[in-house]
Amino acid sequence: ALLPAREATQFLRPRQRRAFQVFEEAKQGHLERECVEELCSREEAREVFENDPETDYFYPRYLDCINKYGSPYTKNSGFATCVQNLPDQCTPNPCDRKGTQACQDLMGNFFCLCKAGWGGRLCDKDVNECSQENGGCLQICHNKPGSFHCSCHSGFELSSDGRTCQDIDECADSEACGEARCKNLPGSYSCLCDEGFAYSSQEKACRDVDECLQGRCEQVCVNSPGSYTCHCDGRGGLKLSQDMDTCEDILPCVPFSVAKSVKSLYLGRMFSGTPVIRLRFKRLQPTRLVAEFDFRTFDPEGILLFAGGHQDSTWIVLALRAGRLELQLRYNGVGRVTSSGPVINHGMWQTISVEELARNLVIKVNRDAVMKIAVAGDLFQPERGLYHLNLTVGGIPFHEKDLVQPINPRLDGCMRSWNWLNGEDTTIQETVKVNTRMQCFSVTERGSFYPGSGFAFYSLDYMRTPLDVGTESTWEVEVVAHIRPAADTGVLFALWAPDLRAVPLSVALVDYHSTKKLKKQLVVLAVEHTALALMEIKVCDGQEHVVTVSLRDGEATLEVDGTRGQSEVSAAQLQERLAVLERHLRSPVLTFAGGLPDVPVTSAPVTAFYRGCMTLEVNRRLLDLDEAAYKHSDITAHSCPPVEPAAA
């Protein structure tokens, strides 16, 4: 085995020293005789040491001893000691005490034999064992004066060989992570929590991360244990985008033929039932009423026109009831109602005319007289030398309860090619031309159109007291919605509790699964903000879909096109949610179609207005938008534009 030069020297030095020991002792006796007992010259000293270096070292110092203690002849004991010590260059010991194993006296010199871990001429320099191959340590080498030792990083312990390290399994201690999951790692360990939770080292437990504090959501953020959900202003036409954090516009995904006809007059614009057109005719010359127009509707009931004076005088009202024309008239305070002719709410154009003759009124449909009524008097009434007639279209100038027979005045119908009193009517034409809301859709089908900008609501009761149950109330909510959506997000049906400003129930279209944070087209059934059931739907296929919802004590079902939806809650959660719903139903609730009022976006999974065609049946009764307590004026109650044909 070969040793490095320095170590080899250290190994050999003591042996060498022992070999010279005999000669050293002889030399000492010779020095005593020549230079201690006697005064010696340089040459005599040379004879003692038999070499120049030792002589050159000794002699100047010898003279120093003489100077200090006097000549040998004074017999000063200090002189003898002074001289005897001069040739031994290890006395006094020049080597470092800590690092020297032995001092070797050499010819005019000395050699410090170092202990292991020390070096330098005087063995006063610490050898850094760590500088070469890390001192043989696997991880950490600690150098120290004259020595070194190995240690390990945190999470490791030193093996019995004092050099290698082995991992400590901290997870063996059941208290390492407290409630959290412990995962051992090389030299460490990690306390793991489920997504949405973070480990608290103080509490040794998983704590919910409030992601909302991190500003992840563009609009409204709701934190939940282990998660969060972002909400967008649905009523403002926004929905969650693909990243589930930012918002984007709700855009139509099915184009509807919403083009309007500038030469048409829409009669259903005023939900209040007030007329869409008010005309007053005045003549010096006595004149008779002549009115003719083309008309189209699917609506079974409503007012086409009124002609006459104030409500207590003489007037006629042409209306629709059960799809047939009805004429209500009052002449000199005496009222009558006549109904006749074919069903005309078939959605096709037909020409209707009203003509006042000398002693009767004639109503015609497509030039065929369907009513001829004898009357005593004129509709134009004289006043201060002029004959007056008020004519209103799509409503009456007084309350419907003051009619001969009350009627719902609202009429979702369309008029064109009108002619009043054989006159050229530029006024209405000019007004309609610049006001698109007064115009009709060019083409319509049956249904109700929700334009994505408003809702309708009703005051309906969902509690019932069956005779066989006595006074105990039961409840049910059964909704059938026939929908042809134009957009992928919107409220179809909802209940609103005005007192609590809560949404006890909602059925809506949504394009993501909120808990799975997954984009998917769904129908959601929810009580307040909790989804009870979800069902996939092909919302943008331009086809009609049937959404059925049934809720009663103990059960809640959602079906789309006959396929039952997936429950999102446990049986216990369902019971709790249904109990919440029932509590709401015992207080006043309003039934909303096509949207919600201005509620917080977190009140329900969806707050956006529905866009598309829809008819709603609630508890086996078809909802008529003309009968609503309120309807947005852009919702058409009995007509819907068709889906635009695909471009060739």
Partner: antibody
Amino acid sequence: QIHLVQSGPELKKPGASVKISCKASGYTFTNYGMNWVKQAPGQGLKWMGWINTNTGEPTYTEEFKGRFVFSLDTSVTTAYLQISTLKAEDTATYFCARDEGWFVYWGQGTLITVSS
Amino acid sequence: ETTVTQSPSSLSVSVGDRVTITCITSTDIDDDMNWYQQKPGKAPKLLISEGNTLRPGVPSRFSSSGSGTDFTFTISSTQPEDFADYYCLQTDSVPLTFGQGTKLEIK
């Protein structure tokens, strides 16, 4: 298109008579009465009265009773204004206007100048 | 007979100015007031009919208000083509009566 076209200007001597015409087109003549309005030079408008185109019955305001006559020829859908025993103060532009309680459609006016 | 008093009889304004003309009736005529514009050598043109109704094709700078006996006609910002004579006409009762007229001149 509704039009009322009046006859041309007339220069007459005091004491003479004049008959001006107003030809109606573009609507049913007998459905609307015909009005007559006078405007003296630099003066305002004055309603003279009207004629029922169904019955031919005229109605005159107090100021225009006597020398003024409204008449019709329904076959040619024309209304006439005749002024007899003309006076200097009859110098004016006379307009016909269709009755609809107010006046929307007017003739272009006929200037009658009475001067000796 | 309902008399109509129109004021002022003449008015001198600059282009862009706001103009107001007033008519007062001797009886309550509800809102049966009409307003006409007449240019030299032409027939009057109906601008606003009963019920303060702006006639088709008439610019929106013309407006009127009033009911009962006090009526106001306004041009919000006078244009060069607006310099003409203006008349009010009540059509509540026979005889129909005009106001004396207002001459709108350029300043």
